[in-house]
Interface confidence: low
Amino acid sequence: AITEAREEAKPYPLFPGPFPGSLQTDHTPLLSLPHASGYQPALMFSPTQPGRPHTGNVAIPQVTSVESKPLPPLAFKHTVGHIILSEHKGVKFNCSISVPNIYQDTTISWWKDGKELLGAHHAITQFYPDDEVTAIIASFSITSVQRSDNGSYICKMKINNEEIVSDPIYIEVQGLPHFTKQPESMNVTRNTAFNLTCQAVGPPEPVNIFWVQNSSRVNEQPEKSPSVLTVPGLTEMAVFSCEAHNDKGLTVSKGVQINIKAIPSPPTEVSIRNSTAHSILISWVPGFDGYSPFRNCSIQVKEADPLSNGSVMIFNTSALPHLYQIKQLQALANYSIGVSCMNEIGWSAVSPWILASTTEGAPSVAPLNVTVFLNESSDNVDIRWMKPPTKQQDGELVGYRISHVWQSAGISKELLEEVGQNGSRARISVQVHNATCTVRIAAVTRGGVGPFSDPVKIFIPAHGWVDYAPSSTPAPGNADPVLII
């Protein structure tokens, strides 16, 4: 990355000595061009072997001058090989070459770590022509270096379909240590060992690490980066950080809080969202999780009726979404509800208990002991029953619904009667003679109509028959009682 200027370093010399062709130091360039970045190499020489006095690549031209004198080999001149500087300083370096004037259209490109630097606006190529040769100086400047500018820079020149490569110029940007790995916040079990890691790099190396716990240094002797701190265990929350030191100074990591896992706080704001005859939908706001994720919650339900046996119903559910529908409750009943949640450490205390009520429901059982008999003198059918047990009425009884079906010679007719809640008998007029009357009764509350009783059948004879007897709800096991008179 080529960054904008903040400070300038001392300039490096453009080239170490005079060029062939008596190039004077006060020559001004006839032409100064920005770096041409569109060029792609056609041929690259292999790197020079170690031990050679000049590590750049050399091109031996195949052409001769008018007098047939062979031209000398072309090579970039030696320049500074290693530049060390601090972050944010400026740097300028160059490569230079003298090219016989017989060559046209020479192009110099800059490369860093094997990749061409395209669009690098701080590269300038200057041409100094003379009688026989042109001195070419390619300068590269970075106005405010950063770590990403570290690397090996070279010049390449394309000439005669071959490439000449300069010696590398190594740029080493030094600065304060830079963290590549910092300690992370953790939630740990009390008195259980855990590790924290800290890693920082230069240059300059080495980088040494000190650990700090609650503003106090943990290790008297620094450790070389990377460093792993093993903490044998904590009994209370602590804040850790690490200091990274090198010759340029010190950098401090972020402070991280190490929390001790504990049982959760009890849930708060337990609320009734919806209530039906046999269920209650509740929600709650979880308490503090004790630095350990909630696993599940327990809803505890007890009857608020002082006459109840005080037993507690337990319903387990997942910790999310802080909602639960409590089912299998009695209608028109009061309940106390509490919520407790657990994490890996244990269960929270129970939330403050809240009072909730179920609504009225339809009765869950039918009237009992239904009996039916024919009162022939008044041409009525008398029906008697016992009301269902109070517990199973699921609300305040408002009456009964009587279904009576008359069947005769393939014709069937159903009639419904509504009866008030007082009393346990009713009288219906005979609808058809020489027919079967089937009676069923259901209890009714404001919550709805309960189940109908088992059918009770009675035969209504033609006029003039005298004897009759009642018909009643069968004993268990008798499926379809019919009393024929």
Partner: antibody, heavy 122, light 106 residues
Framework: QVTLKESGPGILQPSQTLSLTCSFS??????????VGWIRQPSGKGLEWLAH???????YYEPALKSRLTISKDSSKNQVFLKIANVDTADTATYYC??????????????WGTGTTVTVSS | QIVLSQSPAILSAFPGEKVTMTCRAT?????MHWYQQKPGSSPKPWIY???NLTSGVPARFSGSGSGTSYSLTISRVEAEDAATYYC?????????FGGGTKLEIK
């Protein structure tokens, strides 16, 4: 982008009822986990939480003011309302509404309105 | 109710100094939240759940604490940090704020 904007009468007289409206955008009060609260600040003094309302219509009030406060919402219009009955000069303040961030085990006011100034004066 | 006491009420510091303000609760709270308010502006959430910085808050700020004692620390104060900082608990109704610490830059 979440924004909240308070509106109110500006000036009212002692014993009147103060009605405030918080109009918001960028979130819905029908969505799981959403809540909006009211906070006030007398000039030059600190902040005082007044009330908040959750997406499922549960309401919570500052106990000392509970008898005078009513919070409500119209989720379809993205509005929350606060009424303060029987105001007196001590209710003169800047009133803020703020969205509540509902974390797994914590809550805080994560976006605040710009506030509306209310003066109670005879 | 839980009362939050912030100290000091006014804190003066030079740029570059490290400052710490504290918030003490009369009963234990799960988490402490901190808000920054500048004159004429509404409060901004600054630190939530004791030590988490909200988006855009510089890393020189940090929060810590547990139980009844919490603190907000600025490692190197800058001029833009001048404001009043309020702590706030959401553990027990009423959900109270501290009285604030006003940070002045010399």
């Amino acid at each position: 982008q979440v924004t909240l904007k308070e509106s109110g009468p500006g000036i009212l007289q002692p014993s009147q009822t103060l009605s405030l409206t918080c109009s918001f955008s960028g979130f819905s009060l029908s969505t799981f986990g959403m809540g909006v609260g009211w906070i006030r600040q007398p000039s030059g003094k600190g902040l005082e939480w007044l009330a908040h309302i959750w997406w499922y219509d549960d309401k919570y009030y500052e106990p000392a003011l509970k008898s005078r406060l009513t919070i409500s919402k119209d989720s379809s219009k993205n509005q929350v309302f606060l009424k303060i009955a029987n105001v007196d000069t001590a209710d003169t303040a800047t009133y803020y509404c703020a969205r509540i961030y509902y974390g797994t085990s914590y809550r805080y006011f994560d976006v605040w309105g710009t506030g509306t100034t209310v003066t109670v004066s005879s | 109710q839980i009362v939050l006491s912030q100290s000091p009420a006014i804190l003066s510091a030079f740029p570059g100094e490290k400052v710490t303000m504290t918030c003490r609760a009369t009963s234990s709270v799960r988490y402490m939240h901190w808000y920054q308010q500048k004159p004429g502006s509404s409060p901004k959430p600054w630190i939530y759940a004791t030590y988490n910085l909200t988006s855009g808050v510089p890393a020189r700020f940090s929060g810590s604490g547990s139980g009844t004692s919490y603190s907000l620390t600025i490692s190197r104060v800058e001029a833009e940090d001048a404001a009043t900082y309020y702590c706030h608990q959401w553990s027990s109704n009423p959900y109270t704020f501290g009285g604030g610490t006003k940070l002045e830059i010399k």
